[in-house]
Interface confidence: low
């Protein structure tokens, strides 16, 4: 007869593990016993569990309530034996000795491989913020047995770098993901994706990334000139910026106080009906808690009357 | 030796809602990932959802879409808000936890609450 048995068994961790160990013997031939026991390399035989043909299953007290025979019906030729909940711990050699009556002992070994699935951590970087060099955006991190592997997915440009510690029964594996930051990649996703033998699909966590910045600010309302005159209603001047925080904007004259009806409403300064006195330089600050930006305009108000006095000065002059 | 304990529990009408609490004598930072499982009458236990340190979360198909688990490590606290509910979710619930053991090693340190009932009936 011979023993029929599995060169690896691989679990995942927390699953259980069917050890596989069948007699195939002449008729005739009797199992009468078949013993399990730990047989990793340097370590003497540890019994693991007993099957006797009259007496039943005996377990070692270290692994009391995880080792059973699978459920009926049961082949009286078949000694396998399910480890319950598979423990990284429970990785290595096992040895099955099978009895026979009357061909007397065989035995066989296999390899018990635990696959521990890593949970992965994503990890921000500091806080990104236009105009700074090679940063880091986030660090990825995976333990596991065998080693994850871990990459990214993203739109954005950037480099990765990945380092692995390895401890007595699993690996850790570290990703970077560095970008130079840019207004652009302001809300983009930054992927990390694991995967692993022990994953029925890749693991990703995703980072949406923000990134600090200021744009320049300009005053728009001043495209032409002539509609500045005295006498007109509605007029406004419009501060255009934008950023990451959203900034906040503040106007002031340059050469005095705003004039009294000068109305602040954010971004926007609404005049009232205009007169001279509104001429002036005027500032729109923009800020966020990354940056200031000033945009200055000079309003000149036009006078009708004025301009036509000195029309017709000049026509008298000719 | 961390303990944990767990509450919220009690009888609800399908297609209300529980909010499950465990709180933990402990801290839980060093918990590597923390959860619930259930186990109905006659039924073996059964993970419903984990949780990681860095808040990722795993849950079971059963559950997906109704169920959330968040975790405050500020106070040492594992929550499982349990939306729409239905007959099938009756179960004692409990709370696990993990360590890992030295060094980072895969030598899981498991600890469990005493679980706490829910039942879901009109």
């Known amino acids: 007869g011979e023993l029929e048995t599995s060169d690896v068994v691989t679990v995942v961790l927390g699953q259980d593990a069917k050890l596989p160990c069948f007699y195939r013997g002449d008729s005739g031939e009797q199992v009468g016993q078949v013993a399990w026991a730990r047989a990793d390399a340097g370590e003497g035989a540890q019994e693991l569990a007993l099957l006797h043909s009259k007496y039943g299953l005996h377990v070692s007290p270290a692994y009391e309530g995880r080792v059973e025979q699978p459920p009926p019906p049961r082949n009286p030729l078949d000694g396998s034996v399910l480890l319950r909940n598979a423990v990284q711990a429970d990785e290595g050699e096992y040895e099955c000795r099978v009895s026979t009556f009357p061909a007397g002992s065989f035995q066989a070994r296999l390899r018990l491989r635990v696959l521990v699935p890593p949970l992965p951590s994503l990890n921000p970087g500091p806080a990104l913020e236009e105009g700074q060099g090679l940063t880091l955006a986030a660090s990825c991190t995976a333990e596991g047995s065998p080693a994850p592997s871990v990459t990214w997915d993203t739109e954005v440009k950037g480099t990765t770098s990945s380092r692995s510690f390895k401890h007595s029964r699993s690996a850790a594996v570290t990703s970077e993901f560095h970008l130079v930051p840019s207004r652009s990649m302001n809300g983009q996703p930054l992927t990390c994706v694991v995967s692993h033998p022990g994953l029925l699909q890749d693991q990703r966590i995703t980072h949406i990334l923000h990134v600090s910045f200021l744009a320049e600010a300009s005053v728009r309302g001043l495209e032409d000139q002539n509609l500045w005159h005295v006498g007109r209603e509605g007029a406004m001047l419009k501060c255009l910026s934008e950023g990451q925080p959203p900034p906040s904007y503040n106007w002031t004259r340059l050469d005095g106080p705003l004039p009294s009806g000068v109305r602040v409403d954010g971004d926007t300064l609404g005049f009232p009906p205009l007169t001279t006195e509104h001429s002036g330089i005027y500032v729109c600050h923009v800020s966020n808690e990354f940056s200031s930006r000033d945009s200055q305009v000079t309003v000149d108000v036009l006078d009708p009357q004025e301009d036509s006095g000195k029309q017709v000065d000049l026509v008298s002059a000719s | 030796q961390v303990q944990l304990v767990e509450s919220g529990g009690g009888l609800v009408q399908p297609g209300g809602s529980l909010r499950l609490s465990c709180a933990a004598s402990g801290s839980i930072f060093s918990m590597n990932v923390m959860g619930w499982y259930r186990q109905a009458p006659g039924k073996q236990r059964e993970l419903v959802a984990t949780?990681?340190?860095?808040?990722?979360?795993n849950y079971a198909d059963s559950v997906k879409g109704r169920f959330t688990i968040s975790r405050d490590n500020a106070n040492n606290t594992v929550y499982l808000q349990m939306n729409s509910l239905k007959p099938e979710d009756t179960a004692v619930y409990y709370c696990?936890?993990?360590?890992?053991?030295?060094?980072?090693?895969?030598?899981?340190?498991?600890?469990w609450g005493q679980g706490t009932q829910v039942t879901v009936s009109s």
């Open positions: 949780i990681t340190s860095g808040g990722s979360t």
């Open positions: 696990t936890g993990d360590q890992l053991g030295p060094l980072g090693t895969f030598s899981p340190i498991v600890y």
